[in-house]
Every structure is written in structure tokens, then in C-alpha cells.
């Protein structure tokens, strides 16, 4: 057995509509059938959960209806999208992967993706 490695991009720039997407890839040491993916935001020493989803291998991952995250899975790769971001949400977003079943449990934590969010300039009033 060996520890699980998780890879994610170092930097992502959110779109002008406040949407950021990145890939979280894990090197699975075992044959997991149930995987939990969590996105955590680290600001200073505080870590807060942004969203989490558990999925069965081969199935789609589904976040809660009120989640700001959506995602798709393909093998050992998860494509994550975070919506509704504003400039104040700029920060380090960490991908945490847990192989929940069958035992043994494995933990993998990425180094984090720095997401930069720039609020769009308000449109100037037109004189027409």
C-alpha cells in the first residue's frame, strides 16, 4: 500500500461571469467503488468546505442542489466547476479525494489551485 497522490492546476482564472473550472486527478492505489471529492478553500490558516460529492465509480458525481459546484468524472479524473464567484472569493481551492469503499480508506490532498476572480466593470450608462 502507498499514499494516494492528487494533482490539480496551480492557477486558474475565473471567467467574467464568475465561473472557474479545473481538473482534479488522483492516482488510485486500490480498486475503489465509492469516492468522495471535496473542495476546500484555504484562507490564512482557516479551511472551509466549499462543496462535496460522493460518487460510485462509473457513475456521475452529483453535488447537492444548492451547491455552487458541478462536476463530471472520468476514471480517476474529476472535472470541477465552481460558479457564482466574486473577487472576494479569490483564494486557494484544495481538492481532497477520499476512497471510501471498500476498505482500506485512502486520503489524497492536492496542493491547491489558486483561483483569481475579477469582478466585471459595470457597464457605463448609455445616453440613448
Amino acid at each position: 500500500c502507498k499514499a494516494m497522490h492528487v494533482a490539480q492546476p496551480a492557477v486558474v482564472l475565473a471567467s467574467s461571469r464568475g465561473i472557474a473550472s479545473f481538473v482534479c486527478e488522483y492516482a488510485s492505489p486500490g480498486k475503489a467503488t465509492e469516492v468522495r471529492v471535496t473542495v476546500l478553500r484555504q484562507a490564512d490558516s482557516q479551511v472551509t468546505e466549499v462543496c462535496a460529492a460522493t460518487y460510485m465509480m462509473g457513475n456521475e458525481l452529483t453535488f447537492l442542489d444548492d451547491s455552487i459546484c458541478t462536476g463530471t468524472s472520468s476514471g480517476n479524473q474529476v472535472n470541477l466547476t465552481i460558479q457564482g464567484l466574486r473577487a472576494m472569493d479569490t483564494g486557494l481551492y484544495i481538492c481532497k479525494v477520499e476512497l471510501m469503499y471498500p476498505p482500506p480508506y485512502y486520503l489524497g490532498i492536492g496542493n491547491g489551485t489558486q483561483i483569481y476572480v475579477i469582478d466585471p466593470e459595470p457597464c457605463p450608462d448609455s445616453d440613448f
Epitope: A3, L40, I94, K96, P104, Y106
Partner: antibody, heavy 119, light 106 residues
Framework: QVQLVESGGGVVQPGRSLRLSCTAS????????MHWVRQAPGKGLEWVAV????????HYGDSVKGRFTISSDNSKNTLYLQMNSLRAEDTAVYYC????????????WGQGTLVTVSS | EIVLTQSPGTLSLSPGERATLSCRTS?????LAWYQQKPGQAPRLLIY???SRATGIPDRFSGSGSGTDFTLTISRLEPEDFAVYYC?????????FGGGTKVEIK
């Protein structure tokens, strides 16, 4: 603030059962993995079991597998450890502990409850 | 299961001295934590992720290492630092602890 309070320890005969409880406050119980860790008198720490998040997954240490059952009631913010077929070597202080968001290291611990298995 | 080996078993030092505690894991991992335990008390988290200090831990405590060899260093021992220290791996279940190192007053 986060608090964990264990109860249910005591003296029990070999082969008998006991149920430990751990009441949590100050955080959302279902967002964390919750663990039991024990320490035999004068010995080191031994991880016993974990229940994950919504309670659908549980993992156990080899020495208690098949005898101990971990469970939780999220509505009561309470963690349980049902201990069956107790042996003398199960004598220990049992701690409940919260696994942190970034992994199963334990940022908060209860004060512990002593279980003595003796005839 | 992953085996953690701590050394030395006991460290006899004087206040103000530097303490260096070792933890070796049987499998390479960065998911390593350190705890301090005093008699009659629950353990207290010091370090996680091999080198990150937990909230409220004085900066005289530092963790280092990677792969299979890890170190907890107490730069200048204070009277309240004399205790037993445990390392723990949390990357793969079952989560395991080292046997502990007792830091005692010389």
C-alpha cells in the same frame, strides 16, 4: 467552541458488552469523520474506528473488527461505540476525537472514559 | 498496516535545550501528525501535514521531513514541554500511531 464529552465507561466482565457515547457541540457533526481512539494503562495510543460524514461508511482497527460497532445520531450530535465480546486487552481509556477537514488527524479530543474488563 | 517507529524511546534534556524527535514510517506519506500528551490528559495536536503547526501551537515546535523520515523539533524546551509525543499517519486506514517518545527532565 468545540466540545466532546464521553460517557458510558465502567467495569465489565470478559465476554460482556458495553456502549460508549460521545456528545459533540460547537460544530456540524455530519461534516466530519468522527473517531474512537483508545489508550491502555501505561501504553500508547491505538486508533479504534471511524464513522464518515453521513454514517454510510465505517472503518475499524484490526483488533476490534467484528466485535465493535461505531454509529452516530446526527440529530443528537452523538457518537457511539458498541463493544461486544469484551476482552481483558480492551481495558483502556477511550477517547472520541474529531478528524480535521484536511484529513484524519485529530484536532479535538474528549476527556476520555475508562473501560475496565475484569472478572 | 503502516508501521510508525519513534526514536528515541526516552529523551532526557534540560529546560532551554533543543529536542529532536524522530518518526519513521513503513510507507512513504506526507499525511503525518504529531501530538503531545501529559499524564491524565487527552493528546493535543501539534503538527499536521508533516510540517504545519496547529492553531495556538507556539513556534518553538516545528515539524519537518518527507517520504518515510519525519522529525519534530522543540527549539528551546520550556518546563511545560516535558511530556510524551506521538506521531500518527492518516493517509491510509487503519490510522496508526508511533509508540511515543517521552521527553523528561534531566
Amino acid at each position: 467552541q468545540v466540545q466532546l464529552v464521553e460517557s458510558g465507561g465502567g467495569v465489565v466482565q470478559p465476554g460482556r458488552s458495553l456502549r460508549l457515547s460521545c456528545t459533540a457541540s460547537g460544530f456540524t457533526f455530519s461534516n466530519y469523520g468522527m473517531h474512537w481512539v483508545r489508550q491502555a494503562p501505561g501504553k500508547g495510543l491505538e486508533w479504534v474506528a471511524v464513522i464518515w460524514y453521513d454514517g454510510s461508511n465505517k472503518h475499524y482497527g484490526d483488533s476490534v473488527k467484528g466485535r465493535f460497532t461505531i454509529s452516530s445520531d446526527n440529530s443528537k450530535n452523538t457518537l457511539y461505540l458498541q463493544m461486544n465480546s469484551l476482552r481483558a486487552e480492551d481495558t483502556a481509556v477511550y477517547y472520541c476525537a474529531r478528524g480535521e477537514r484536511l484529513g484524519s488527524y485529530f484536532d479535538y479530543w474528549g476527556q476520555g472514559t475508562l473501560v475496565t474488563v475484569s472478572s | 498496516e503502516i508501521v510508525l517507529t519513534q526514536s528515541p524511546g526516552t529523551l532526557s534534556l534540560s529546560p532551554g535545550e533543543r529536542a529532536t524527535l524522530s518518526c519513521r514510517t513503513s510507507v512513504s506519506s506526507s499525511y503525518l501528525a504529531w501530538y503531545q500528551q501529559k499524564p491524565g490528559q487527552a493528546p493535543r495536536l501539534l503538527i499536521y501535514g508533516a510540517s504545519s503547526r496547529a492553531t495556538g501551537i507556539p513556534d518553538r515546535f516545528s515539524g519537518s521531513g518527507s517520504g518515510t523520515d519525519f522529525t519534530l523539533t522543540i527549539s528551546r524546551l520550556e518546563p511545560e514541554d516535558f511530556a510524551v509525543y506521538y506521531c500518527q499517519q492518516y493517509g491510509i486506514s487503519p490510522f496508526t500511531f508511533g509508540g511515543g517518545t517521552k521527553v523528561e527532565i534531566k
